[in-house]
Interface confidence: low
Amino acid sequence: MQVSTAALAVLLCTMALCNQFSASLAADTPTACCFSYTSRQIPQNFIADYFETSSQCSKPGVIFLTKRSRQVCADPSEEWVQKYVSDLELSA
């Protein structure tokens, strides 16, 4: 039985750890999936890198890596996410 979106939101976004990150159950990040998205825009100067989630995931997602090595799932349809990705590509 596949776990529900609600349960996966609980998985890593608990009272102690709620940075809206509910992704990546594997240490090799290319297999990461997003099951919920951050509800807040992350300050752009916090972002170090990004990667897109696998096409095999049930939801599309962009995972931003912050300069403090946090990983945050974001909705690729949001304008700010697209802008950050474009800026990161341009600066690469």
């Epitope: 890593l12 608990t14 009272m15 102690a16 750890l17 159950l25 240490a27 990461a32 990983q71």
Partner: nanobody, 111 residues
Amino acid sequence: EVQLVESGGGLVQPGGSLRLSCAASGFAFSTNAMSWVRQAPGKGLEWISTINSGGWRSYADSVKGRFTISRDDGQNTLYLQMNSLKPEDTAVYYCVHQNYRGQGTQVTVSS
């Protein structure tokens, strides 16, 4: 470097019990939420349970009342006590911290 090492799996008869352990290192264990997930043969990852640094616990409906998650912050160890095991609990069980998981421990429930 984050390391998670699970142990305690094995072959058990239906109705039996097992206690899984996860030895954690490379991060501040006591201040982080920890979880167990499992993967049955040919299936995707299924979330089982989470415990946060304050001891708050959450369980999947499929294991509620049978499984108990706990932690020992002094030993940097996460536990999963599994009682009243069923054949459908057969899976590889993984300990999870953020975007890391261990290599897993196999649990087989069969008569």
